[in-house]
């Protein structure tokens, strides 16, 4: 039941990477508009994306206020020409989202290998510490700032001509790996939060190989 010709939103889904967080839903509106509300468990509902015909709403600004809180969103449906109209219960038709805890659930973005430097039989590989949209004291925090020691990186590397892969992990953003002198190696990195039950790993970084422009080589 609800307002005539107005349908409730459904398939409410959180899409979040490195805390950039968008709520998506269906259906595409026909003669109706949507408004989204978001709240922590405090029940202090805040309205966003007022009377929109979009089927998504960027809620990043709200969730970055405290990424360890659990959030719920709800999408209200209104007739396009009469947003004051309410459903049979005396309020607009709405549907709730699943709960979302950014710190535990945001996807880890694809990392980037920033640089690698070979000194003899050692190669130092640095993974870029990506900036997030989480702020503290008016400064955007990096992924490492937010997750601290909860975040590790895994480096997969192999001789350019070989199929056998080796791995190395770090609690920082730097790896120091042993290589054979005069042999070219390729590698990619993956961000991991081992303590998570979902979304534990990022997608793989692009593969980088020694001899490419990001590298530096010293005897």
């Amino acid at each position: 039941s609800g307002t005539t010709n107005t349908v409730a939103a459904y398939n409410l889904t959180w899409k979040s990477t490195n805390f950039k967080t968008i709520l998506e839903w269906e259906p595409k509106p026909v003669n109706q508009v949507y408004t989204v509300q978001i709240s922590t468990k405090s029940g202090d509902w805040k309205s966003k994306c007022f009377y929109t015909t979009d089927t998504e709403c960027d809620l990043t600004d709200e969730i970055v206020k405290d990424v360890k809180q659990t959030y719920l969103a709800r999408v209200f449906s209104y007739p396009a020409g009469n947003v004051e109209s309410t459903g049979s219960a005396g309020e607009p038709l709405y549907e709730n989202s699943p709960e979302f805890t950014p710190y535990l659930e945001t996807n880890l973005g694809q990392p980037t290998i920033q640089s690698f430097e070979q000194v003899g039989t050692k190669v130092n590989v640095t993974v870029e510490d990506e900036r997030t949209l989480v702020r503290r004291n008016n400064t955007f925090l990096s992924l490492r700032d937010v997750f601290g020691k909860d975040l590790i990186y895994t480096l997969y590397y192999w001789k350019d001509s070989s199929t056998g892969r080796k791995t190395n992990t770090t609690h920082t953003n730097e790896f120091l790996i042993d290589v054979e002198k005069g042999v070219s190696y390729c590698f990619f990195a993956q961000a991991v939060i081992p303590s998570r039950t979902v979304n534990r790993k990022s997608t793989d970084s692009p593969v980088e190989c020694m001899g490419q422009e990001k590298g530096e080589f010293r005897e």
Epitope: S42, D44, A89
Partner: antibody, heavy 118, light 106 residues
Framework: EVQLLESGGGLVQPGGSLRLSCAAS????????MGWVRQAPGKGLEWVST????????YYADSVKGRFTISRDNSKNTLYLQMNSLRAEDTAVYYC???????????WGKGTTVTVSS | DIQMTQSPSTLSASVGDRVTITCRAS??????LAWYQQKPGKAPKLLIY???SLESGVPSRFSGSGSGTEFTLTISSLQPDDFATYYC????????FGGGTKVEIK
Amino acid sequence: EVQLLESGGGLVQPGGSLRLSCAASGFTFSDYAMGWVRQAPGKGLEWVSTISGSGGLTYYADSVKGRFTISRDNSKNTLYLQMNSLRAEDTAVYYCAKAPYGYYMDVWGKGTTVTVSS
Amino acid sequence: DIQMTQSPSTLSASVGDRVTITCRASQSISSWLAWYQQKPGKAPKLLIYKASSLESGVPSRFSGSGSGTEFTLTISSLQPDDFATYYCQQYKSYITFGGGTKVEIK
């Protein structure tokens, strides 16, 4: 341990007033909506009122609207229910409850009894 | 207001029985339903929220199912501690409780 302890119940005459309190401990009080639920003798549960964590949003059952006022003092971790113009049908055990999103009640106090009678 | 109707109002059962309590909403409430257990002279205790999510610390013999207008609470094997009154509660539009189901010893 999360605990809620109600107080302030008692015997009051019809038309009288009473203020119930609920002292909370074991959790960050301001992070949660809170509510009052009552139960008349031998009857079922009836939702009375809910307040958001900041105190900025309040909701009331039709049966108490205009007579009861819910409030909270986050500095004291305390929830209140000011009950005015009391009627015999307000006689009940009043429970304070922690209410995530203002939706369901995951922790309840032991209750305080309000009797409205002449 | 959304009305919640529970059935049966009283249920006689024995230890070990599988018990099912039904709750019907007067209009669709999606999955926005909670179940509580209350013993005489005690406060209610949350068992299930969002129709089927088991509250932390609640024994796994309790389960909830349903969506829309029809919901069930199931106790897979009734234990002595389970004789109590059970209430459903919708939170789709404000809050309303069902009238309760008393589970008593047969």
